[in-house]
């Protein structure tokens, strides 16, 4: 057989999300082999004939690659021999979403694992004080989201309060006609309070915090991918 000891190797994948228009990574690790030419990596996508990517004998073999992935894929070549079969995907498209299989063959055995790849758009929100309004208000903006997210406001002082009556949220389609800009305004804010603007869809959740005092404005934001 040419395989010592066993015929099945452990392959591990992680569900991940791609931000359309940016580069993404489909994560896959495996029990490493000690020699590069003993390793074959194949990435496949459910419903697609041909391969997403193939790496064998220390080189990419793109002879069977499906045209929708042409010029957009790469493995981390220097990491293959230590068990990293992750795939770099350039310029993520909405249509890249789906079920992928990471198939590995080494001189020790073979194995595969599936991963769900979600695609959408998500971005950090930025909150600013809107001094133009008749009463002091906060403006929360995030440039790229898809699918359309929900937006909610919260405050440290008024925990559990419903701010839907005193906020206004709008979604503006961006020029590529897929992603949208999110703008939400919260009215009648008080100083010496911390407000949070939370934007969430089925792919990501982003939170922007702002603390307004007499002397300064402090901001913080974070982004978390869901189910990954």
């Amino acid at each position: 057989f040419g395989i010592s000891g066993k015929h099945f190797i452990t392959v591990t994948t992680f569900t991940s999300a791609g931000n359309i228009g940016e580069d993404g990574t489909l994560s896959c690790t495996f029990e490493p082999d000690i020699k590069l030419n003993g390793i074959v990596i194949q990435w496949l996508k459910e419903g697609i004939k041909g391969l997403v990517h193939e790496f064998k004998e220390g080189k990419d073999d793109l002879s069977q690659q499906h045209e929708m992935f042409r010029g957009r894929t790469a493995v981390f070549a220097d990491q293959v021999v230590v068990g990293n079969a992750s795939l770099r995907l350039k310029n993520v498209q909405l249509t890249d979403a789906g079920t992928y299989t990471c198939y590995i063959r080494t001189s020790k055995g073979k194995g595969n694992a599936n991963l769900e790849y979600k695609t959408g758009a998500f971005s950090m929100p930025e909150i600013n004080v809107d001094y133009n309004a008749s009463s002091e208000s906060l403006r929360c903006e995030a440039p790229r989201w898809f699918p359309q997210p929900t937006v909610a406001w919260a405050s440290q002082v008024d925990q559990g309060a419903n701010f839907s009556e005193v906020s206004n949220t709008s979604f503006e389609l961006n020029s590529e006609n897929v992603t949208m800009k999110v703008v939400s305004v919260l009215y009648n804010v008080t100083i010496n309070n911390t407000y949070s603007c939370m934007i969430e869809n089925d792919i990501a959740k982003a939170t922007g915090d702002i603390k307004v005092t007499d002397s300064e404005v402090k901001r913080r934001s974070q982004l978390q991918l869901l189910n990954s």
Epitope: S4, G5, K6, E31, P32, I34, K35, L36, N37, G38, E57, G58, K59, A77, D78, Q79, V81, V82, G83, K108
Partner: antibody
Framework: QVQLVQSGAEVKKPGASVKVSCKAS????????MHWVKQAPGQGLEWIAA????????DYNQKFKGKAKITAVTSTSTAYMELSSLRSEDTAVYYC??????????WGQGTMVTVSS | EIVLTQSPATLSLSPGERATLSCKAS??????VAWYQQKPGQAPRLLIS???YRYTGVPDRFSGSGSGTDFTLTISSLEPEDFAVYYC?????????FGGGTKVEIK
């Protein structure tokens, strides 16, 4: 941080055996190959063998089959190499080295084995 | 067995000079070559992995290039601590093999 600590120098008579140990710390011992490399006095480096502690898979340089036997004990994160039927040409420094993020990125300090009658 | 031939065997240079070390493989090894530095009484130290990836903490005066059968390690401007023996090693196929080494000595 990753550390590989080898056992001390040994002096052996021809025909005897010696067992060199390599204790690993600072990483998941079972997830990475551990290799053994020989360096005779004033000479270059020679790969002996490797073991994957996660499933005890081994790979030997044909030249050292029958001479070296490598094992690993996962409970103590320790790799061992036993050299048998020692001869003067086995006199060398033996290194353990692992491949965590890159090839041979961490090395033990080396164990000098001297074979002398 | 893949044979790696390093040249020259010895390189006599002065601090500040450029060092170019060669490693030739007896067959195509793709990019699966690493370079190590060894000083007397010490274990080898990884400098370059996968032909051209500089390892963490390695000064940027060290660079690696090549693929297939011809590989080069370049030290752009030698520092006193760079005088040592340098080995190339292939992990394309087993048995894993090392070159015979190049000694970089002070002129």
């Amino acid at each position: 941080q990753v550390q590989l600590v080898q056992s001390g120098a040994e002096v052996k008579k021809p025909g005897a055996s010696v067992k060199v140990s390599c204790k690993a710390s600072g990483y998941t011992f079972t997830s990475y190959w551990m290799h053994w490399v020989k360096q005779a006095p004033g000479q270059g480096l020679e790969w002996i063998a490797a073991i994957y502690p996660g499933n005890s898979d081994t790979d030997y340089n044909q030249k050292f089959k029958g001479k070296a036997k490598i094992t690993a004990v996962t409970s103590t994160s320790t790799a061992y190499m036993e050299l048998s039927s020692l001869r003067s040409e086995d006199t060398a420094v033996y290194y353990c080295t692992t491949t965590v993020a890159h090839y041979f990125d961490y090395w033990g300090q080396g164990t000098m084995v001297t074979v002398s009658s | 067995e893949i044979v790696l031939t390093q040249s020259p065997a010895t390189l006599s240079l002065s601090p500040g000079e450029r060092a170019t070390l060669s490693c030739k493989a007896s067959q195509d090894v793709s990019f699966a070559v690493a370079w190590y530095q060894q000083k007397p009484g010490q274990a080898p130290r990884l400098l370059i992995s996968s032909a051209s990836y500089r390892y963490t903490g390695v000064p940027d005066r060290f660079s690696g290039s090549g693929s297939g059968t011809d590989f080069t390690l370049t030290i752009s401007s030698l520092e006193p601590e760079d005088f040592a023996v340098y080995y190339c090693q292939q992990h394309y196929n087993t048995p894993l093999t090392f070159g015979g080494g190049t000694k970089v000595e002070i002129k």
